[in-house]
């Protein structure tokens, strides 16, 4: 069987600041079972921006039924984007575990922020 | 507001032990990667530890095998264990903050930890 | 590992004046400087980052230039509250992070 990839179509992404930001991910595979986490960043300082299992995101919502066992879509859309919020988005798939580890990362998509249109 | 609070620190001998602490507030602290950084007297910033939000740790040669970081999210607390003291360790230990672009937007006020005998 | 190397140590100036400080990275780091003020008895404080720009709250009288191995801080105007130790840090990729030396700005 064919290994899981994360995809995430998008290169970049630009948003108006006040709207909202939706960013693309989907997996090609059900296995391995696990989470997806969604991160600002790449290296060992990335900010947590999604997490599946837990965790508090009043920003983010998801754009299709993710606890659904079957879902392979974990695209987000993260609400009233400012210029704080550009950066590198990373799709991140976890493999099931105590703790769980990372299996694979998208290639990222990097959100740009235009100004408020007046 | 963000606040960081540091406690712990005081005098011991080397080869002691010590275990300091770091209460956050004001932000979402199971989200972002959080760093200790030490400043011994009179002397400038040098990092030693970092704890991803995945809980992955990363240290300074200088302490590594000897320093142990951990944080408890439902707790909002980073923690420095520091084991085998040395003089040198002597310094003001603060808890920082880091963005997802390595900036260390937040600090505490710091705890000074002396090392002698 | 990165070196930075801060110049110089000390610059004594008065108020009003403009002050220059240098940092030299010991390969490039493109644009992913920051430099961080540190006052007496205080934790250090995010000034700039990117090399050139302004953290949240910070004056325009800082500025920030530079790119690959040679970076500058400039203080337009010295005000008294801007007598304090400067120091620059990296933000390329992973830990160590590595912060330069310091220059301390001193009233003349």
């Known amino acids: 069987e064919e290994e899981l990839q994360v995809i995430q179509p998008d290169k970049s992404v630009s948003v108006a600041a006040g709207e909202s930001a939706i960013l693309h991910c989907t997996v090609t595979s059900l296995i391995p079972v696990g989470p997806i986490q969604w991160f600002r960043g790449a290296g060992p300082a990335r900010e947590l921006i999604y997490n599946q299992k837990e965790g508090h995101f009043p920003r983010v919502t998801t754009v299709s039924e993710s606890t659904k066992r079957e879902n392979m879509d974990f695209s987000i859309s993260i609400s009233n984007i400012t210029p704080a919020d550009a950066g590198t988005y990373y799709c991140v798939k976890f493999r099931k575990g105590s703790p769980d580890t990372e299996f694979k990362s998208g290639a990222g998509t990097e959100l740009s922020v235009r100004a408020k249109p007046s | 507001d963000v606040q960081l609070v540091e406690s712990g620190g005081g005098v011991v001998r080397p080869g002691e032990s010590l275990r300091l602490s770091c209460a956050a507030s004001?932000?979402?602290?199971?989200?972002?990667?959080m760093n200790w950084v030490r400043q011994a007297p009179g002397e400038g910033l040098e990092w030693v530890s970092l704890?991803?939000?995945?809980?992955?740790?990363y240290y300074a040669d200088s302490v590594k095998g000897r320093f142990t970081i951990s944080r408890d999210n439902s707790k909002n607390t980073l923690y420095l264990q520091m084991n085998s003291l040395r003089a040198e360790d002597t310094a003001v230990y603060y808890c920082?903050?880091?963005?997802?672009?390595?900036?260390?937007?937040?600090w505490g006020l710091g705890t000074l930890v002396t090392v002698s005998s | 590992e990165i070196v930075l190397t801060q110049s110089p140590g000390t610059l004594s100036l008065s108020p009003g004046e403009r002050a220059t400080l240098s940092c030299r990275a010991s390969?490039?780091?493109?644009?992913?400087l920051a430099w961080y003020q540190q006052k007496p008895g205080q934790a250090p404080r995010l000034l700039i980052y990117?090399?050139?720009t302004r953290a949240t709250g910070i004056p325009d009288r800082f500025s920030g230039s530079g790119s690959g191995t040679d970076f500058t801080l400039t203080i337009n105007r010295l005000e008294p509250e801007d007598f304090a130790v400067y120091y620059c840090?990296?933000?390329?990729?992973?830990?160590?992070?590595?912060f330069g030396g310091g220059t301390k700005v001193e009233i003349k």
């Open positions: 840090q990296h933000q390329y990729d992973w830990p160590p992070y590595i």
């Open positions: 004001g932000f979402t602290f199971s989200n972002f990667a």
């Open positions: 390969q490039p780091i493109d644009s992913y």
């Open positions: 704890i991803s939000v995945t809980a992955t740790t």
């Open positions: 920082a903050k880091v963005t997802w672009n390595n900036l260390f937007d937040y």
């Open positions: 990117n090399t050139v």
